[in-house]
């Protein structure tokens, strides 16, 4: 006769491991008992269990409640056992020793491999600001057994670097994603992808990029200078900028206070019916936590009864 087993049994942490051992005997041969032992190198054999043909399953106190026979129907030549709720410490070499008569004893070894799926974590880097050089956007760490694979999935251009730390029964892998921040990256997803044989599918953690920036400011409303004449209603100036975080707007007049009746509504400056008092230099001040910008325009309210030249100056300053 001969023993049939597996070279390696692979199981995910917490699952039950079936340790196979089947005696393929000749006609008339019988199995008296099957003893299972842990036989890691450098340590003496430690018995897990003994399956006795007449007196049933005996279990070592160290494995009480964790070793069972597979569910019926059972073949009397099948010495397989179930090791319940596999833990990392169960990983190692096991031996099945089958005592038969009249043929004697047979033994076979297998290796139990316990996969420990990773629980990845993603840590964003420092705040990203436009104008910075190569900056850490995020790091992703996953620990498991065997070592997991950590990669990145993104449309953003960047560079990655990985490092691994080996522990006694597992390995931790950390991958970093570096980029040169630009406003076009704002709102873009950066996804850490963790692969591992103990996972049914890759684990993905997505981080949305936030890049602080503030665009140059400009003022609209003076495109048609002929509209800025005495008596005109509904005249307005609008300050244009964009930023992350969204900026706030403030209007001032460089050559004095804002004239009475002029309304400030965020990025818009609304005028009452125009008079020559409204002529002057107006400044839009745009700011967010990252930066501030100014844009100034000169308003020249025309008297239609005068034939004097009409002139508007636009000046931008940062």
């Amino acid at each position: 006769g001969e023993l049939e087993t597996s070279d390696v049994v692979t199981v995910v942490l917490g699952q039950d491991a079936k340790l196979p051992c089947f005696y393929r005997g000749d006609s008339g041969e019988q199995v008296g008992q099957v003893a299972w032992a842990r036989v890691d190198a450098g340590e003496g054999a430690q018995e897990l269990a003994l399956l006795h043909s007449k007196y049933g399953l005996h279990v070592s106190p160290a494995y009480e409640g964790r070793v069972e026979q597979p569910p019926p129907p059972r073949n009397p030549l099948d010495g397989s056992v179930l090791l319940r709720n596999a833990v990392q410490a169960d990983e190692g070499e096991y031996e099945c020793r089958v005592s038969t008569f009249p043929a004697g004893s047979f033994q076979a070894r297998l290796r139990l491999r316990v996969l420990v799926p990773p629980l990845p974590s993603l840590n964003p880097g420092p705040a990203l600001e436009e104008g910075q050089g190569l900056t850490l956007a995020a790091s992703c760490t996953a620990e498991g057994s065997p070592a997991p694979s950590v990669t990145w999935d993104t449309e953003v251009k960047g560079t990655t670097s990985s490092r691994s730390f080996k522990h006694s029964r597992s390995a931790a892998v950390t991958s970093e994603f570096h980029l040169v921040p630009s406003r076009s990256m704002n709102g873009q997803p950066l996804t850490c992808v963790v692969s591992h044989p103990g996972l049914l599918q890759d684990q993905r953690i997505t981080h949305i990029l936030h890049v602080s920036f503030l665009a140059e400011a400009s003022v609209r409303g003076l495109e048609d200078q002929n509209l800025w004449h005495i008596g005109r209603e509904g005249a307005m100036l609008k300050c244009l900028s964009e930023g992350q975080p969204p900026p706030s707007y403030n209007w001032t007049r460089l050559d004095g206070p804002l004239p009475s009746g002029v309304r400030v509504d965020g990025d818009t400056l609304g005028f009452p019916p125009l008079t020559t008092e409204h002529s002057g230099i107006y400044v839009c001040h745009v700011s967010n936590e990252f930066s501030s910008r100014d844009s100034q325009v000169t308003v020249d309210v025309l008297d239609p009864q005068e034939d004097s030249g009409k002139q508007v100056d636009l000046v931008s300053a940062s």
């Epitope: 003893a35 018995e47 269990a49 003994l50 006795h52 007449k54 005996h58 005592s99």
Partner: nanobody, 118 residues
């Protein structure tokens, strides 16, 4: 041939404890399982617990959590610690040894009486 000698029986109150011991001599190299059987009056002899040379154990459901078997292979002894004893544990307890050649218990001690009564 294997000779088995038990000791430690007696009278004990319900809820009490007793420890039985058994020493083996003779052809001890052939011993595989060692165990304890019991036989109450007018009942069949039943296997209470058994232990392999490697220390794997089996208990009858009726004694699980109350009885503990231990074996010293070097000294050729097997002990049975009995706690939380009940009236239904009253019986003659027999130490037994199983031969590696036959795979059944073929060596027996003379038996020791355990009586649980108030």
């Amino acid at each position: 041939e294997v000779q088995l000698v038990e000791s430690g029986g007696g009278l004990v109150q319900p809820g009490g404890s007793l420890r039985l011991s058994c020493a083996a001599s003779g052809s001890i190299s052939s011993i595989n399982l060692m165990g304890w059987f019991r036989q109450a009056p007018a009942k069949q002899r039943e296997l209470v617990t058994s232990i392999s040379p490697g220390g794997s154990v089996r208990y009858a459901d009726s004694v699980k959590g109350r009885f503990t078997i231990s074996r010293d292979v070097a000294k050729n002894t097997v002990d049975l610690q009995m706690n939380s004893l009940r009236a239904e544990d009253t019986a003659v307890y027999y130490c037994a040894a199983e031969s590696e050649r036959t795979y059944y218990f073929d060596s027996w001690g003379q038996g020791t009486q355990v009586t649980v009564s108030s």
